[in-house]
């Protein structure tokens, strides 16, 4: 959705919530891919009733994406050629480079529960290294 | 530039109606959720209600649920709220704000305009 | 609901002092807690949200810090345009709530 402002930094962070909190985020955990390849980030929330009105996409403290309710999907700027949005209410990154490697932030906006907040880290891996198998693995 | 400018306000009797109007400028209005805030004579600030941008999304405080309707009109640029069975304790000054795009704040306030409740 | 407890409700400082406001909230709330000044017979200001972001076109001597329950509010070194009420908000959750309020006064 073209909406009409430049490119800026949302913030991250990891739970709160309203005191009535029932939902959980599954995510796709701990995932790596290959360098110039393709990866889907997934989240999805359960066991409330809460109504989402927003999902936030980010990267530390970076914004990459946005699917509102009312309005869609926006992808910031700095992101709109190596992003996309979905599947469903996920994000696609495209043409991963090592500096992808991090942690990403699923962050639904709800009422009434407040906001729930989904972590995945992704590692990028070298050609020759994804080859061989490798995969990266926190215990 | 962002302008927000509020109207509507005025003196109304306890158990009486007003319509408080926001106009909004220099940004497209239809792509954000919008607030109203009130702050009572020499007091903090109190949020009112909220509205999504397309409208599929509207909350309330329960000091003002089953009273007040926040709604809007995108091809008007304009937000409205609706105050029925005034209190005393509505008298403040209401303020419209924008949400930022990534429900992270309010960025932009009006001016305000004030409502008083009083016999 | 959320309760924000600012403090101290009032302060006096001079220009180029440090300031620091703290609000503390009643349950965590992650990091989403925004900073606003107001200024006398005007609409409040965003400064600072997500704890830490600073609003763009705001001065960098503004700084926000904390998570859960526990924030700051850092002004490095106080101007004449400084002189205000500040607020935090939660925006964690709705209803979203304020906190009382710190007056920044001219000592």
């Known amino acids: 959705y073209p909406y009409d402002v430049p490119d800026y930094a949302g913030g991250g962070g990891s739970g709160g919530g309203g005191s009535m909190m029932t939902g959980t985020i599954e995510t796709t955990g701990n995932i790596s891919a290959e360098k110039g390849g393709s990866i889907i980030l997934q989240c999805h929330l359960s066991s409330t009733t809460a109504q989402v009105a927003q999902v936030n996409w980010e990267q530390q403290d970076q914004l990459l994406a946005i699917c509102n309710a009312d309005l869609g999907w926006h992808i910031s700027p700095s992101f709109k050629d190596r992003v996309a949005p979905g599947p469903g209410l996920g994000l696609t990154l495209q043409s991963l480079t090592v500096n992808d490697t991090g942690e990403y932030f699923c962050i639904y906006h709800t009422y009434p529960d407040g906001t729930y907040t989904g972590r995945i880290f992704l590692e990028v891996l070298e050609s020759s290294v994804a080859e061989h198998g490798a995969r990266f693995q926190i215990p | 530039e962002v302008q927000l400018v509020e109207s509507g306000g005025g003196l109304v009797q306890p158990g009486g109606s007003l319509r408080l109007s926001c106009a909004a400028s220099?940004?497209?209005?239809?792509?954000?959720?919008m607030h109203w805030v009130r702050q009572a004579p020499g007091k903090g600030l109190e949020w009112v209600a909220f509205?999504?941008?397309?409208?599929?999304?509207?909350y309330y405080a329960d000091t003002v649920k089953g009273r007040f309707t926040i709604s809007r009109d995108n091809a008007k640029n304009s937000l409205y709220l609706q105050m029925n069975s005034l209190r005393a304790e509505d008298t403040a000054v209401y303020y419209c704000a924008r949400m930022r795009l990534d429900y992270y704040a309010m960025d932009y306030w009006g001016q305000g305009t004030m409502v008083t409740v009083s016999s | 609901d959320i309760q924000m407890t600012q403090s101290p409700s009032s302060l006096s400082a001079s220009v180029g002092d440090r300031v620091t406001i703290t609000c503390r909230a009643s349950k965590s709330i992650s990091k989403y807690l925004a900073w606003y000044q107001q200024k006398p017979g005007k609409a409040p200001k965003l400064l600072i949200y997500?704890?830490?972001t600073l609003q763009s076109g705001v001065p960098s001597r503004f700084s926000g810090s904390g998570s859960g329950t526990d924030f700051t509010l850092t002004i490095s070194s106080l101007q004449p345009e400084d002189f205000a009420t500040y607020y935090c908000?939660?925006?964690?959750?709705?209803?979203?709530?304020f906190g009382g309020g710190t007056k920044v006064e001219i000592k």
């Open positions: 997500s704890g830490s």
């Open positions: 220099g940004f497209t209005f239809s792509n954000f959720g």
């Open positions: 908000q939660q925006h964690n959750e709705y209803p979203w709530t």
């Open positions: 509205i999504s941008s397309g409208s599929s999304s509207i």
